[in-house]
Amino acid sequence: DAHKSEVAHRFKDLGEENFKALVLIAFAQYLQQCPFEDHVKLVNEVTEFAKTCVADESAENCDKSLHTLFGDKLCTVATLRETYGEMADCCAKQEPERNECFLQHKDDNPNLPRLVRPEVDVMCTAFHDNEETFLKKYLYEIARRHPYFYAPELLFFAKRYKAAFTECCQAADKAACLLPKLDELRDEGKASSAKQRLKCASLQKFGERAFKAWAVARLSQRFPKAEFAEVSKLVTDLTKVHTECCHGDLLECADDRADLAKYICENQDSISSKLKECCEKPLLEKSHCIAEVENDEMPADLPSLAADFVESKDVCKNYAEAKDVFLGMFLYEYARRHPDYSVVLLLRLAKTYETTLEKCCAAADPHECYAKVFDEFKPLVEEPQNLIKQNCELFEQLGEYKFQNALLVRYTKKVPQVSTPTLVEVSRNLGKVGSKCCKHPEAKRMPCAEDYLSVVLNQLCVLHEKTPVSDRVTKCCTESLVNRRPCFSALEVDETYVPKEFNAETFTFHADICTLSEKERQIKKQTALVELVKHKPKATKEQLKAVMDDFAAFVEKCCKADDKETCFAEEGKKLVAASQAALGL
């Protein structure tokens, strides 16, 4: 399927609108600091060039690879060295090393200002004045802040963003119509970004085999009626799509994702009975819908797994003939029977099974050796079940904010070297598992909770990788993808940690806290809590809770005061002195 001109091929497949949007996303994900106008100019230049190649595929440079064309274009940016420092050195390299170099410089936590939402009327005016620029700006701002955002899915978000403004800017109460929609898009967008980040980390840090194993387990749960060969085909195609997107090949990725959606819909009879509604939707909605589709019902009367994977005399023969295929079949069979297990648990079981076969198939009596392999699964299954039960009980007792605080204390004591903003962000997200998953019945709790925790802990891992400060975090992040959560759960208080020196500035607050949203105010309090634990890691839960209540009383008092700033200055000093006296800070 070789094309004379790759850029012409993708332009024709995707259409001009999607082509331009995807090139903008690609450029913004690579050059995260560049102004919007510069990116638009580069995109227009690439688009004009693509059109010349569509007209004549033999035209000059049309035969070049997309990486070459895009890389050359990025390297024309005049301020590359001043803005990006050593990333400019990438431009001295040849493809494919140049693209790899750009990928390595993607920043998960770019130093960009927080996106502040303007007044609704201001946004509606901007939308009406220039809809195209308004929507491009959305793509640009999201892409540069989330350099691994799944590009074809971002097109779907942009479509919903446009629909929200189209509808709400005509409504009687624009704000009541628009703001909840924007909140929903923001929250879904953050979740989508984090989920995709885990897929890319899985591919980049643990390799294609790890990603394929994840995909076999997840797709087998989702499509339990599909044959193993069908699931394997879907896994191969899905792996290609995500490898491309994670590698910055966004045009190929979007094109292949569309092909995969088409294939799934054409073959839904042999895949799942739940796809009908998805397959009636337009392309972007269809792909999104398929990715989120509920698990199909399990086929009735599935035989016991033991027959093929424990009792059969051919276990070692089948394993030796094609190890990964046999393990893939095991994973497929186990996963389709267990929609109640998390994907990471299924992968742990498969790993245990693999380890047992590796050992036993070399033993004198292999069958005797592996006969009890399923017994080894019991503690692996019970560990997340118990953990989820305990934490859901705690969540129900405390509510989300105080559950987050409990996790903040727990994780700060485990890894106190990690930066305070990272601990706050990660612990707040870990705490959201309660509202997200504890409402589910037992059969849905584990896949909801543990797979969500994998996504959140990956955020910790990628943020920590940028500036590593804790050997314990590095160890849990790098040793095993599927055991990250158990590794973090098993960490106790870091006894080697030398408490942070007390700094009064850290605990100085101002009247601006009074005008913050409830969420922002919570973050301020949680930041103080992390700092408190870093200063006093031996403080008991009760002491920390009491000091935080003093802090709440202080904020409440000063926010009611006539002279708020004076109150914060004077009472703040008293609060610090009182806490120092009580905790011996």
């Epitope: 405390l398 105080k402 002491q543 009491a546 209540d549 409440e556 009182a578 006296a581």
Partner: nanobody, 124 residues
Framework: QVQLVESGGGLVQAGDSLRLSCAAS????????MGWFRQAPGKEREFVAR????????YYADSVKGRFTGSRDNAKNTVYLQMNSLKPEDTAVYYC?????????????????WGQGTQVTVSS
């Protein structure tokens, strides 16, 4: 469950002093802030003072600031309210309360356990 018992109320002249005590038993005492509230006939229960968990930080209602002092002795599970320069408008039933896990520090709804109250009457 916590039992709180106030004592020390009585009838005094304007300008006099009284010291209220509140003895706690049951649930952990030292981990929670304690509050003093009062309720005059026909009025809402109002905040008077909050004494933090360690006794190192005290907040007062503007109407009593400079005249009343809250303190606590965690070894004795007791909280105190020293009331000086009493005025007739200080007449009320005084309650001590233990802080709950949520809600405002300056509102009765933010406190979980309550004593039965002690009457303070200030005559002119």
């Amino acid at each position: 469950q916590v039992q709180l018992v106030e004592s020390g109320g009585g009838l005094v002249q304007a300008g006099d002093s009284l010291r209220l005590s509140c003895a706690a038993s049951g649930r952990t005492f030292s981990g929670y802030a304690m509050g003093w509230f009062r309720q005059a006939p026909g009025k809402e229960r109002e905040f008077v003072a909050r004494i933090n968990w360690s006794g190192t930080l005290t907040y007062y209602a503007d109407s009593v600031k400079g005249r009343f002092t809250g303190s606590r002795d965690n070894a004795k599970n007791t909280v105190y309210l020293q009331m000086n320069s009493l005025k007739p408008e200080d007449t009320a039933v005084y309650y001590c309360a233990q802080r709950g896990d949520s809600g405002s520090n300056y509102d009765p709804s933010g406190y979980r356990y309550w004593g039965q109250g002690t009457q303070v009457t200030v005559s002119s």
